[in-house]
């Protein structure tokens, strides 16, 4: 069950973790001691589900979190918007070389919407994600964390859907929101010709040819 959130008209949302009511129930590996689902409140006092991990004291961390299957709905390129907090290692006493300040984002294309396990070698790395500003002493409030936003895109996609995965290697992270969307060119009318909603191409600069039709009471 999802609640509605308002996004730009040219973006079609495939996944919005903040709109899910109840637990997200994504798959974590290991099952315990890694990523943990945590409920917090948004500014409207509505519960939102987040995932957090903070094993900064222990070396050799390899904690994975995988979303449910995401249908691509014909989109060849999708965008991933992540809102997260990330702890500055300098603010954590005694963590030395074990603390990291990045995490990794992966995807895996699949026609199977019910894969139960995380097979790390199937996933393709999208990018290493770092905070634009970690939250230690943001302004003067050391109990208030800056919410970072990073957007990445991936494509061309060809299978029915895909899974996203987040790999922690020893950082202190909270994933507050994950949104996956594709872009479309909205319905347009030019010179009495109507062009339908059209999903953008595989590349950001791709031109997609689309056939128009005459508006009512006009002829070709």
């Amino acid at each position: 069950v999802t609640g509605s959130r308002v996004y730009p008209a040219n973006e079609v949302t495939l996944l919005d973790s903040r709109s899910v009511q109840g637990e997200l129930g994504w798959i974590a590996s290991p099952l315990e001691g890694g990523w943990e689902e945590v409920s917090i409140m948004d500014e409207k006092n509505t519960p939102i589900r987040t995932y957090q991990v903070c094993n900064v004291m222990e070396p050799s961390q390899n904690n994975w979190l995988r979303t449910d299957w995401i249908t691509r709905e014909g989109a060849q390129r999708v965008y991933i918007e992540i809102k997260f907090t990330l702890r500055d290692c300098n603010s954590l006493p005694g963590v030395m070389g074990t603390c990291k300040e990045t995490f990794n984002l992966y995807y895996y294309e699949s026609d199977n919407d019910k894969e139960r396990f995380i097979r790390e070698n199937q996933f393709v790395k999208i990018d290493t994600i770092a905070a634009d500003e970690s939250f230690t002493q943001v302004d003067i409030g050391d109990r208030i964390m800056k919410l970072n936003t990073e957007i990445r895109d991936v494509g061309p996609l060809s299978k029915k859907g895909f899974y996203l995965a987040f790999q922690d290697v020893g950082a202190c992270i909270a994933l507050v929101s994950v949104r996956v969307f594709y872009k479309k060119c909205p319905l347009t009318v030019r010179n009495l010709a109507q062009f339908p909603d059209t999903i953008t191409g595989a590349d950001t600069s791709s031109l997609v040819e689309v056939r128009g039709s005459c508006v009512n009471n006009s002829e070709e």
Epitope: V38, D42, E43, Q52, R143, L147
Partner: antibody
Framework: EVQLVQSGAEVKKPGSSVKVSCKAS????????ISWVRQAPGQGLEWMGG????????NYAQKFQGRVTMTRDTSISTAYMELSRLRSDDTAVYYC???????????????????WGQGTMVTVSS | DVVMTQSPLSLPVTPGEPASISCRSS???????????LDWYLQKPGQSPQLLIY???NRASGVPDRFSGSGSGTDFTLKISRVEAEDVGVYYC?????????FGGGTKVEIK
């Protein structure tokens, strides 16, 4: 309705340690911060420190640094506060208190101590 | 560290009449996100404290609407529009912007 239930009163000798527990019933324990606040007889409230999950490690008031350890065991929904090298002026009621976590569009923080334990009286006397 | 100063120390009140408590911080509690990190608590005799107001002006769940919080930066006020007998106790303000969190010294509200 979430409740925080603390361990019973303690009488301790100077130089010893005390460990107070705070068990949550109801709600998701991992979803909120736990702070510890103490109140000496006839005095005001004093914040000792706390653990905010998405901040990572415990955060202690400088006054108690090196003497206090705060931990939590999410599997049994219990938080602990251990104070060592006790002195007579540590005689006080020790409270655990819950803080809800929230995120706005630009930042994350906490929403005040909305639920308190009943308090644990710790008496330090020779 | 932020220092919190409350006044008055003691406040004798008449039921049905309004009451006001002032709290001043040594540093601004207004964050760039627009929130004032100031909470108000009431500790009734023999009880644990209870949250009345968070983030300067937001009433906590179950708190009667006769309680209101106002102010910004360094100066804050808790108002009780019509005092009731059950409102007696010690009122504390607390800054929650940065560690160490700090409480005011308290204001004891008692019936005249």
């Amino acid at each position: 309705e979430v409740q925080l239930v603390q361990s019973g009163a303690e009488v301790k000798k100077p130089g010893s340690s005390v460990k107070v527990s705070c068990k949550a019933s109801g709600g998701t324990f991992s979803s909120y911060a736990i702070s510890w606040v103490r109140q000496a007889p006839g005095q005001g409230l004093e914040w000792m420190g706390g653990i905010i999950p998405i901040f990572g490690t415990a955060n202690y008031a400088q006054k108690f640094q090196g003497r206090v350890t705060m931990t939590r065991d999410t599997s049994i929904s219990t938080a602990y506060m251990e104070l060592s090298r006790l002195r007579s002026d540590d005689t006080a009621v020790y409270y655990c208190a819950r803080e809800l976590l929230y995120c706005s569009s630009t930042s994350c923080g906490t929403h005040g101590f909305d639920i308190w334990g009943q308090g644990t009286m710790v008496t330090v006397s020779s | 560290d932020v220092v919190m100063t409350q006044s008055p120390l003691s406040l004798p009140v008449t039921p049905g009449e309004p009451a006001s408590i002032s709290c001043r911080s040594s540093q601004s509690l207004l964050h760039s996100n627009g929130y004032n990190y100031l909470d108000w608590y009431l500790q009734k005799p023999g009880q644990s404290p209870q949250l009345l107001i968070y983030l300067g002006s937001n009433r906590a769940s179950g708190v009667p609407d006769r309680f209101s919080g106002s102010g910004s930066g360094t100066d804050f006020t808790l108002k009780i529009s019509r005092v009731e007998a059950e409102d007696v106790g010690v009122y504390y303000c607390m800054q929650a912007l940065q560690t160490p969190l700090a409480f005011g010294g308290g204001t004891k509200v008692e019936i005249k």
